[in-house]
Interface confidence: medium
C-alpha cells in the first residue's frame, strides 16, 4: 500500500507521459488521477516504468474500479495485464474478440499463464458459447488449447485452425479428442502430396480409423513406433501382418520391444502365428496354425 500524501505543487499530472518516470511511488499515487489513467491506458506501454511504478498504477485502477475494470480499460491494459492476478480477472466481463486478442498478444510466445487461462474462461462465459472466431483466435495463440476442450466443443473447431497445431500441442489430447480432430486434420491437409501429408497428419493419427491406416500402408510412409503405439487399438486390430509391415517399413523391427504393450500385444493375439513368423522378429502369442478364428462380435450381432 502507498501512503496517502498530498501532491506537491505543480506536479499534478495533466496527461500520462514519459515525465512520470521521474515520479516517486508516492508522487504517482498522489499526483496521477485514476480517471485520467483509465482514459490514457494505451500510453502506459510506451513509457519505461519500473515494476514498482506499475504496481502503483495498477493500485490506482483497482481503487477506481473495485468491482472490476470496464472493457474500455481492459482492451488497453497492454503489458499491465501481466500484473493482474486471476482474482482480478475474474471480476472482468470481456466480450470483445479484439480485447481478447490484444491481451493474448501481450503473452505471446509464452506458455498459457493462470491469467490467460482465467481470461479465456471469462471470455467464453461472457460470450455464452465457443464460436468459431473465438476458437480460431485461441488456437492461433495456443494450439495446445485444443486438448483442453471437450469433444463437443472441438466439433466447432474450423479445419483451418489445424494448420497452427504442432505435434507437441496434441500430447495431452485423449483418444476421444483425437477422434474429433483427426477428420478435421484430414480435411485440412487433403490437398498435400503423400509424404508431406503424412508429416502433417502423423500427430493426429490417434483418431484414425482402420481404413485410413490401410490406405497409409500402401504409401511407403515408414511410420515410427511412437506414432504406432498411439493408434487406436480398435483401428489396429483388423490390420494384417503385411499391412503393418508396410505401414512401419524399416521400423517394423521395433514391434519386438513393444510386444507386451497395447496396441501391439492385442494385435499379436489376433494374428496367425505363421504370419507373425514371416516378420522374423520372434513375436509370440499369435493364433496357432490349424485353429479356427471366431469373430465373437459378429456372432453376437447375428444372434
Amino acid at each position: 500500500e502507498v501512503e496517502k500524501t498530498a501532491c506537491p505543487s505543480g506536479k499534478k499530472a495533466r496527461e500520462i507521459d514519459e515525465s512520470l518516470i521521474f515520479y516517486k511511488k508516492w508522487e504517482l499515487e498522489a499526483c496521477v488521477d485514476a480517471a485520467l489513467l483509465a482514459t490514457q491506458m494505451d500510453r502506459v506501454n510506451a513509457i519505461p516504468f519500473t515494476y514498482e511504478q506499475l504496481d502503483v498504477l495498477k493500485h490506482k485502477l483497482d481503487e477506481l474500479y473495485p468491482q472490476g475494470y470496464p472493457e474500455s480499460v481492459i482492451q488497453h491494459l497492454g503489458y499491465l495485464f501481466l500484473k493482474m492476478s486471476p482474482e482480478d480477472i475474474r471480476k472482468w466481463n470481456v466480450t470483445s474478440l479484439e480485447t481478447l486478442k490484444a491481451l493474448l498478444e501481450v503473452n505471446k510466445g509464452h506458455e498459457m499463464s493462470p491469467q490467460v487461462a482465467t481470461l479465456i474462461d471469462r471470455f467464453v462465459k461472457g460470450r455464452g458459447q465457443l464460436d468459431k472466431d473465438t476458437l480460431d483466435t485461441l488456437t492461433a495463440f495456443y494450439p495446445g488449447y485444443l486438448c483442453s476442450l471437450s469433444p463437443e466443443e472441438l466439433s466447432s473447431v474450423p479445419p483451418s485452425s489445424i494448420w497452427a497445431v504442432r505435434p507437441q500441442d496434441l500430447d495431452t489430447c485423449d483418444p476421444r479428442q483425437l477422434d474429433v480432430l483427426y477428420p478435421k486434420a484430414r480435411l485440412a491437409f487433403q490437398n498435400m502430396n503423400g509424404s508431406e501429408y503424412f508429416v502433417k497428419i502423423q500427430s493426429f493419427l490417434g483418431g484414425a480409423p482402420t481404413e485410413d491406416l490401410k490406405a497409409l500402408s500402401q504409401q511407403n510412409v515408414s511410420m515410427d513406433l511412437a506414432t504406432f503405439m498411439k493408434l487406436r487399438t480398435d483401428a489396429v486390430l483388423p490390420l494384417t501382418v503385411a499391412e503393418v509391415q508396410k505401414l512401419l517399413g524399416p521400423h517394423v523391427e521395433g514391434l519386438k520391444a513393444e510386444e507386451r504393450h497395447r496396441p501391439v500385444r492385442d494385435w499379436i493375439l489376433r494374428q496367425r502365428q505363421d504370419d507373425l513368423d514371416t516378420l522374423g522378429l520372434g513375436l509370440q502369442g499369435g493364433i496357432p496354425n490349424g485353429y479356427l478364428v471366431l469373430d465373437l462380435s459378429m456372432q453376437e450381432a447375428l444372434s
Epitope: E18, N45, A46, I47, T50, Y51, L82, K108, H110
Partner: nanobody
Framework: VQLVESGGGLVQPGGSLRLSCAAS????????VAWYRQAPGEQREPVAA???????IYADSVKGRFTISRDNAKNTVYLQMNSLKPEDTAMYSC???????????WGQGTLVTVS
Amino acid sequence: VQLVESGGGLVQPGGSLRLSCAASGSMFSINAVAWYRQAPGEQREPVAAMTSGGSTIYADSVKGRFTISRDNAKNTVYLQMNSLKPEDTAMYSCIYCRYDGEFAYWGQGTLVTVS
C-alpha cells in the same frame, strides 16, 4: 533477454563518456528504454528515457549535458554524457521495457567515477 552495459570508467570533471547498452533479442525498436543511476548509499534514480515513439526526457540535473539515443539495427541504446560532475559518480544501468511478455530487463550496470 540480456542487457550488457559498457563505456563506464574514471574521468575528470568536465570530461565526457559514452555509455552503451546492448540488448539481445528482437522487437528492440518498439520498446521503451531508459538509463538509471545509483550513487553509493542512494536510491536508484532515472536519468534519461526514450519512449517507444522516440520522444526523450531527462532529469533536471542532467538536462543539456546528457543525451539518450538508440540504434535499432544494433539493438543498442546510448547515453552520451558531457560536462561530467563529481555528483554524476554512480553505477549506471539501462532498463529495457516490454520485450517478449516481460515488463523490464535491467542490466548489471557500468560504473562511472568523476574525480
